[in-house]
Interface confidence: medium
């Protein structure tokens, strides 16, 4: 329904706090560079405002759009032109233009340094001292660097935060306690991150329809005894929620996510067994828990899909008649009977439905043409499963430092034009597929695997595109996204790569990396390791391995030494020279 | 959007039988669940019996017509159908035809429907 007023309906359905909450991460998602204080004067007169249209939503300017209201507020910053160049070219646009011009403007790596935790004494003073501006610079600093973080997700970690930070500053050990629980938090972020710039790709390169399929195979596998029409139901809603949050409108999106939280608690008997645990939840940990629920059991004696899709002698008539429904309950079908398969994969397989009946359905004998499209499904199922198989095991052999490597050794050959960086956090988020996903059960490594890789190489892609400089990537990057993945895994070695030249500096440290944290010494030694397959991309696995091995001894004996300077300045050059050597 | 037309109604005596026909048009008929309801002479809607979206789906039924009823559907001409057996005086009523997301919910004898048929009337009697 309409609303005379749009921010006063948002702020009285979404409360005070998650309304202020939403529109720091709004303004921190756009202006990436701004300060958290200058956010926050922002966000108070945005909601000081709302409430002055709460209070009487004739008020003057309550009835404009939110885009407009926040777009106002953005472009009467001060300098914002020195601050952000041609961003503010973007005010000079009318709405919807305006808006999707600061779309257009966010960066998805930012150049910003790496946020780092302050040590936890100083943590639990400033969050005791002053909760909601603690967590409000976390929303920030989260916000400015991942600009399409899911906002409604990112209040529920925040949420998170705060419950560790409160339960935490009580102990004695603050930092024992304090340090693996934020770190779980942070990786369930971070992953998340990935995982929503990758729906955001999606719908902005392909649209809603390819997003829609996704939820459909999605919410199929989740909620095998639904109908088809209620899965349509829930794929509409989330693939309107998702747009909403992609496209900037976050308000209307937590709004909207709520409203499907609630429909799915009120409708659990036509949805799911398994949701009532959750629905008893405040809000964001409701709508978190239903985004996170388990699969629902199967049901019993499902027919053969064959039946419908194959052996029906209407077929193509019920095809024809409405391609989509017919598509979309195929992959309804086929993704309720496989929670062992990745998205990705069942909508691969429903791609070759289609493309098969469209073949078929033009021929003289339909059902003798498309009768044995099931079977041609088994080459397409089988590759993930081998690539779940030969990198679990893999990973298992060499450990997740181990596997990282070998997959940074293998992008870099197939892309030795990327960027050591890119390819240093690419082939470091890749080799944690294997701690994520290769130790759990069987039916659900193939799912875990492919969706994930498919997140991380999207983020490959988004980085790339900033700055193109691989033909291959470019090709991988430009297909549907579905085939991404697959288009990754059939690179190899760029033939075309003309060695980059042995420089020593590349390969010179200093005492300085003896102090660094572990992570930091193992993305120097990857640094160097990816530098080294630049210069020479056909070296061998044991070559790589001898230098490396050479490279970490050296290493551990200089941070061992008494004048450590003194070891690195003199033992450096040799290590370049064998290095060099061994690489010959 | 579907617009549902009822027909196979009449006048049959006890113990016989009669087969209901729901036509639906629109091109998603595949997308819903459909279902029949009945409405006896001064009695309120009263839940017959439902069929999840495929021709091979789950079907539910109401206790009094258990064993008598079989609900089908045939999607490939957007039909419905109500084969009624062993019929007695109490099954007289007009009978609807409607769509829905779920055959579930319909159970629950909602009265906002999405979509009805304008119903067929169908009595037993000697």
């Known amino acids: 329904e309409a609303h005379k007023s749009e921010i006063a309906h948002r702020f009285k359905d979404l409360g005070e706090q998650h309304f202020k909450g939403l529109v720091l991460i709004a303004f921190s998602q756009y202006l990436q560079k701004c300060p958290y204080e200058e956010h926050i004067k922002l966000v108070q007169e945005v909601t000081d405002f709302a409430k002055t249209c709460v209070a009487d939503e004739n008020a003057e300017n309550c009835d404009k759009s939110i885009h407009t209201l926040f777009g106002d507020k953005l472009c009467a910053i001060p300098k914002l032109r020195d601050n952000y160049g041609e961003l503010a070219d973007c005010c000079a646009k009318q709405e919807p233009e305006r808006n999707e011009c600061f779309l257009q403007h966010k960066d998805d790596n930012p150049n910003l340094p790496p946020f780092q935790r302050p040590e936890a004494e100083a943590m639990c003073t400033s969050f005791q001292e002053n909760p909601t501006s603690f967590l409000g610079h976390y929303l920030h600093e989260v916000a400015r660097r991942h600009p399409y973080f899911y906002a409604p997700e990112l209040l529920y970690y925040a949420e998170k935060y705060n419950e560790v930070l409160t339960q935490c500053c009580t102990e004695s050990d603050k930092a024992a306690c304090l340090t693996p629980k934020l770190d779980a938090v942070k990786e369930k972020a971070l992953v998340a991150a990935v995982r929503q710039r990758m729906k955001c790709s999606s719908m902005q390169r392909f649209g809603e329809r390819a997003f829609k399929a996704w939820a459909v195979a999605r919410m199929s596998q989740r909620f095998p005894n639904a109908e088809f029409a209620e899965i349509t139901k829930l794929a509409t809603d989330v693939t309107k929620i998702n747009k909403e949050c992609c496209h900037g409108d976050l308000l209307e999106c937590a709004d909207d996510r709520a409203e499907l939280a609630k429909y799915m608690c009120e409708n659990q008997a036509t949805i799911s067994s398994k949701l009532q645990a959750c629905c008893d939840k405040p809000v964001l940990q409701k709508s978190q828990c239903l985004a996170e629920i388990e699969h629902d059991n199967i049901p019993a004696d499902l027919p053969s899909i064959a039946a419908d899709f194959v052996e029906d002698k209407e077929v193509c008539k019920n095809y024809a008649e409405a391609k989509d429904v017919f598509l979309g309950t195929f992959l309804y079908e086929y993704s309720r009977r496989h929670p062992d398969y990745s998205v990705s994969l069942l909508l691969r397989l429903a791609k070759k439905y289609e493309a098969t009946l469209e073949k078929c359905c033009a021929e003289g004998d339909p059902p003798a043409c498309y009768g044995t499209v099931l079977a041609e499904f088994q080459p397409l199922v089988e590759e993930p499963k081998n690539l779940v198989k030969t990198n679990c095991e893999l990973y298992e052999k060499l450990g997740e430092y181990g596997f990282q490597n070998a997959v940074l050794v293998r992008y870099t050959q197939k892309a030795p034009q990327v960027s050591t960086p890119t390819l240093v956090e690419a082939a470091r988020n890749l080799g944690r597929v294997g701690t994520k996903c290769c130790t759990l059960p069987e039916a659900q490594r193939l799912p875990c695997v492919e969706d994930y890789l498919s997140a991380i190489l999207n983020r490959l892609c988004v980085l790339h595109e900033k700055t193109p400089v691989s033909e291959k990537v470019t090709k991988c990057c430009s297909g549907s996204l579905v085939e991404r993945r697959p288009c990754f895994s059939a690179l190899t070695v760029d033939e075309t790569y003309v060695p980059k030249e042995f420089k020593a500096e590349t390969f010179t440290f200093h005492s300085d990396i003896c102090t660094l944290p572990d992570k930091e010494k193992q993305i120097k030694k990857q640094t160097a390791l990816a530098e080294l397959v630049k210069h020479k991309p056909k070296a061998t696995e044991d070559q790589l391995k001898t230098v490396m091995g050479d490279f970490a001894q050296f290493v551990d004996k200089c941070c061992k030494a008494a004048d450590k300077d003194n070891c690195f300045a003199t033992e450096g050059p040799n290590l370049v020279a064998r290095s060099k050597e061994a690489l010959a | 959007e579907v617009q549902l037309v009822e027909s196979g109604g009449g006048l049959v005596q006890p113990g016989g039988s009669l087969r209901l026909s729901c036509a639906a048009s629109g091109r998603t008929f595949i997308a819903y669940a459909m279902g029949w309801f009945r409405q006896a002479p001064g009695k309120g809607l009263e839940f017959v019996s439902a069929?999840?979206?495929?021709?091979?789906?789950?079907?539910y039924y109401a206790d009094s017509v258990k064993g008598r009823f079989t609900i089908s559907r045939d999607n490939s001409k957007n039909t419905l159908y109500l084969q009624m057996n062993s019929l007695r005086a109490e099954d007289t009523a007009v009978y609807y035809c409607?769509?829905?997301?779920?055959?579930?919910?319909?159970?629950?004898?909602?009265?906002?429907?999405?979509?009805w048929g304008q119903g067929t009337l169908v009595t037993v009697s000697s």
């Open positions: 409607a769509a829905d997301r779920s055959a579930q919910t319909m159970r629950q004898v909602r009265p906002v429907l999405p979509y």
């Open positions: 069929i999840t979206n495929f021709a091979g789906g789950t079907t």
